[in-house]
């Protein structure tokens, strides 16, 4: 007996975008307060009714008089085939399901899209559809002329497909991949035919989880929000993916205007516990994450304002900021970092409600600092505020060194010419500007004959000429607050200088190694002196000073060149303030090869010798120690007389060669020669490093032996 | 067959706004992507705008977006670019496409020229 | 942007030669490149697209080749009917782009 309950009024309807099949339905004979559990077998067939390709049991509550909705979402578009979908139903008791007594089916019903789609000769579908990486899609076409051959295309290669009628042609495609934002192209055509018909398939990349979602207030007003989206899903076509913000204990939602970042009003009624579930979402699928937290563990403060210096002195300053205010009062801890030339030279912490203090002590006068403050929450740390920089410079002081000064003495015409250097001081020396150095010139035999000069900075030397007496000369920096403590230097007439041995140094590319032997009696230290450029007029005068217990120094210089001889004078310093010459020292920091030769003078020519000789050859301008010299003569002889031995040059011309090992013997006679002979002789100076150059040989033809002298 | 017929030509100032329309025969209209193609004075192609066969997205080229606008109507067959803020720049010959494959131009009109200039 | 480059601006050839015209894609376009002829009236034709797919109607003695960044376009026994520019056109990313033209002459 047929149940009574059968489903009745069942109408199809489509939805061609989301190939999906909607059913709606009622059930009869229903009282109008009955409510009744109940099964419906749904049947859905392909082409044919007999070609069933989906059943489901439905299971859902029935009221009288109810329309029953339900949904299915075809893999294969709509507009490929016809469906025929048809249903019966049962009352649904749980404890024996196999045991159900169905109504009869109803009949088919006929959903066909191709009635429909008008009288081109091609068609493709699904028309832009929207699908996920990795899915699988399923295309068709639809011919309207069975004749012709067609072939379907993914991205212009060819796809195979299965013909479902002489129309249609279906095509799976599995695990698709996202190929570019404007879609996948699929594309049919008829052979020999002169259309081409294509459809997009958009494929978005899937839609990730927000990552690093975090929020906080600045204001104790607004909540910011921040979260990393992702990768992009790639797509042009849709709306790209919308993030909603939704707080479970006030109940309040806002769709967020930003990919990455979302404000939300701090409620007045000081709600302190936030639940935030952050939801990104796309046409194709939803993904959230949630945080709680309280709203003072969130606190990011702004950056502290109006920074000022007050009661700035030589050492000291009290730096005083203000904060934002926080709600409630609370408490913040400001970092003060101080810098001194770039770097870090004191940090401290300070607890600020409102306002800022803090002392910095143990600066430097007249130097500039930069200080910078940032704050956070002091109980609850979450981040700290951007720095704000200010910077403030002390006040000068005078100078608290005495300059470093050195002379010069050069006796011209009875009288003596002193000129006075002295290097600048530092900056923690100088407190402030210098702005004029003064020099007292005392007479040591006429006490109250003093002389008083000023130079103007940023000069750093003077010329005094005196008479041939001692004299204490006294030099002192000064700037706007004071004077420094005074450089005392004693000159005499004679400085005697003269009577010190050279002694010769090896210079290494570390510099001059020196040393002296300590001076007994009273010393106040010693000074090495030497210039960085001995070849140039002004020769760059330079001195070291050093304690009365040093007796060695390295001298180095960036001015130090190779092939250059550096002079160095060490002098003593005694208790009354007079330098005395110690020692005398000479060497270079790199010997090189000598480069030119001695200009020989050829005398004394006669049938069997002449003499050369090469007097103005000055051998300190070389540029390495003359230890002696080369004397060769060519000869068509080719014989070498005894004192000389054979030598090959470089272009394997043979000579003989004379060796002087004396560098102040600069006159040499070649001897044992024949008369009316041709000679070639060349003169050239050797070191430890080498000779100097094979250049040109100077031609010489003897005279007979009856010739005049 | 395909006909495409661009119209509208016309000489404008700069910041001036001018519509070109295209008309379509011979095919079904509103099953077929639509693009509109230029070609400078110095006979350099470049893609302008794209709409799909429904209409409901398009593309625009950097050069011309926020100034010009591609619409369709596929009732009367008609494709249209509505053009603003025009620059001389913008001075070329106007072509309307027919697109069944996506960023490949199958049809083209004979152009519509556009000069834009003081 | 991707940029099309097409080195040979202008290309002369006699009747029946087989002439080959080249075009270099700044980045990777897979097989996404399409060509055109634009006779001296302005008239534009699509020839080839996905490289080497002859658009209806176009003669057998056009052909494509290439693939990623490297595409040519040969014709085989050239033909008056021939003399015209030829674009080169990426449609794989946004905005599409063209080549600057290669003019084919009559030598």
């Known amino acids: 007996e047929p149940l009574p309950w059968a489903p009745e009024s069942l109408k199809v309807s489509i939805n061609s975008t989301h190939q999906c099949l909607h059913l709606q339905w009622s059930v009869h004979n229903l009282a109008y307060h009955q409510e009744l559990k109940m099964v419906f077998q749904i049947e859905i067939s392909r082409i044919k009714t007999s070609n069933v390709i989906w059943v489901e049991n439905y299971s859902t509550t029935v009221k009288g008089n109810q329309l029953l909705h339900w949904s299915w979402e075809s893999q294969l578009p709509l507009e490929c085939a016809k469906h025929f979908i048809r249903m019966r139903s049962a009352v649904d008791d749980a404890t024996t399901p196999e045991q159900r007594f169905w109504s009869n089916w109803s009949s088919w019903e006929e959903v066909d899209v191709q009635n429909s789609l008008g009288h081109e000769p091609l068609f493709v579908f699904p028309k832009d559809k929207l699908v996920e990486e990795g899915s699988n899609v399923t295309i068709c076409y639809v011919s309207r002329s069975q004749q012709n051959n067609i072939s379907c295309y993914l991205e212009g290669v060819r796809m195979q497909g299965q013909q479902l009628d002489p129309n249609v042609s279906m095509f799976n495609l599995h695990n698709v991949a996202f190929i570019r934002e404007t879609g996948t192209n699929i594309y049919c055509k008829v052979d020999r035919g002169d259309d081409i018909k294509g459809i997009v398939l958009f494929v978005s990349k899937i839609l990730e989880e927000p990552k690093d979602f975090s929020c906080e207030t600045r204001d104790f007003q607004t909540l910011s929000c921040t979260w990393d989206p992702g990768r992009d899903t790639g797509l042009l076509k849709q709306l790209p993916q919308s993030y909603t913000l939704f707080e479970s204990f006030s109940g309040k939602k806002t769709l967020c205007k930003h990919k990455g970042w979302c404000n939300w009003q701090v409620a007045p009624e000081s709600q302190e516990m936030y639940n935030f579930t952050l939801t990104a979402e796309n046409y194709l699928r939803k993904r959230s994450v949630h945080i709680l937290f309280n709203l003072t563990h969130r606190v990011h403060p702004m950056a502290p304002f109006n920074v000022l210096f007050k009661d700035v002195s030589v050492t000291n300053a009290t730096m005083t900021w203000k904060v934002h205010s926080t709600g409630n009062y609370y408490t913040l801890l400001c970092q003060v970092e101080l810098y001194g030339e770039g770097k870090v030279i004191q940090k401290h912490n300070v607890s600020v409600k409102v306002n800022g203090e803090l002392v910095l002590s143990g600066l430097e006068p007249d130097t500039e600092y930069s200080a910078q403050v940032r704050c956070a929450n002091a109980n609850h740390f979450w981040k700290w505020s951007e720095w704000t920089r200010q910077n403030f410079t002390t006040v000068e002081a005078a100078p608290s060194e005495a300059p470093d000064v050195w002379r010069n003495v050069k006796s011209v015409q009875g009288y003596c010419v002193v000129t006075l250097f002295w290097k600048p001081l530092s900056r923690l020396q100088a407190n402030g500007e210098i702005l004029f150095y003064n020099i007292v010139v005392e007479d040591l035999d006429r006490p109250s004959g003093l002389q008083l000069l000023s130079v103007p900075a940023p000069a750093n030397r003077t010329e005094l000429t005196l008479d041939q007496r001692a004299y204490q000369i006294h030099v002192t920096a000064n700037n706007s607050v004071g004077t420094s403590p005074a450089s005392v230097l004693v000159v005499s007439g004679d400085p005697g200088d003269e009577e010190v041995e050279e002694e010769r140094v090896k210079g290494t590319e570390d510099g001059f190694s020196l040393s002296w032997k300590p001076q007994p009696g009273n010393i106040t230290g010693y000074i090495v002196e030497w210039c960085d450029r001995p070849r140039d007029p002004l020769c760059d005068l330079q001195w070291k000073h050093l304690g009365p217990n040093t007796t060695s120094t390295v001298i180095s210089s960036d001015a130090f060149r190779p092939g250059v001889r550096y002079n160095f004078r060490i002098y003593g310093i005694s208790t009354e303030m007079v330098p005395y010459l110690l020692e005398k020292k000479t060497g270079y920091s790199q010997e090189l090869a000598p480069s030119d030769n001695p200009r020989v003078v050829m005398s004394n020519l006669t049938s069997h010798s002449f003499t050369l000789s090469w007097k103005d050859y000055s051998t300190e301008s070389q540029p390495s120690f003359i230890r002696g010299y080369h004397v060769y003569l060519k000869s068509k002889a080719g014989q070498c007389h005894p004192g000389s031995e054979k030598a090959v040059l470089s272009d394997d011309s043979v000579c003989c060669k004379y060796k002087i090992d004396d560098p102040k013997q600069k006159m040499f006679v070649v001897g044992n020669l024949q008369p009316e002979s041709f000679y070639e002789f060349l003169v050239t100076p050797y070191s430890a490093v080498g000779e100097g150059p094979h250049g040109a040989f100077t031609k010489v033809t003897t005279p007979d032996e009856y010739s005049p002298m | 067959d395909v006909k495409l017929v661009e119209s509208g030509e016309g000489l404008v100032k700069p910041g001036g706004s001018l519509k070109l329309s295209c008309a379509a025969s011979?095919?079904?209209?509103?099953?077929?992507?639509m693009s509109w193609v230029r070609q400078t004075p110095e006979k350099r192609l470049e893609w302008v705008t794209y709409?799909?066969?429904?209409?409901?997205?398009?593309y625009y080229a950097d050069t011309v977006k926020g100034r010009f606008t591609i619409s369709r109507d596929n009732a009367r067959n008609t494709l249209y670019l509505q053009m603003s803020s025009l620059k001389s720049e913008d001075t070329a010959m106007y072509y309307c496409?027919?697109?069944?494959?996506?960023?490949?131009?199958?049809?083209w009109g004979q152009g519509t020229l556009v000069t834009v200039s003081a | 942007d991707i940029q099309m480059t097409q080195t040979t601006s202008s290309l002369s050839a006699s009747l029946g030669d087989r002439v080959t015209i080249s075009c270099r894609a700044s980045q990777d376009i897979t097989n996404y490149l399409n060509w055109y002829q634009q006779k001296p009236d302005g008239t534009v034709k699509l020839l080839i697209y996905?490289?080497?797919t002859l658009h209806s109607g176009v003669p057998s003695r056009f052909s494509g080749s290439g693939s990623g960044t490297d595409f040519s376009l040969t014709i085989s026994n050239l033909e008056q009917e021939d003399i015209a520019t030829y674009f080169c056109q990426q449609g794989h990313m946004l905005p599409w782009t063209f080549g600057g033209g290669t003019k084919l002459e009559i030598k």
């Open positions: 011979g095919f079904t209209f509103s099953s077929y992507a």
């Open positions: 496409t027919r697109d069944p494959i996506t960023g490949t131009f199958a049809y």
């Open positions: 996905y490289t080497s």
């Open positions: 709409i799909s066969s429904g209409g409901d997205y398009f």
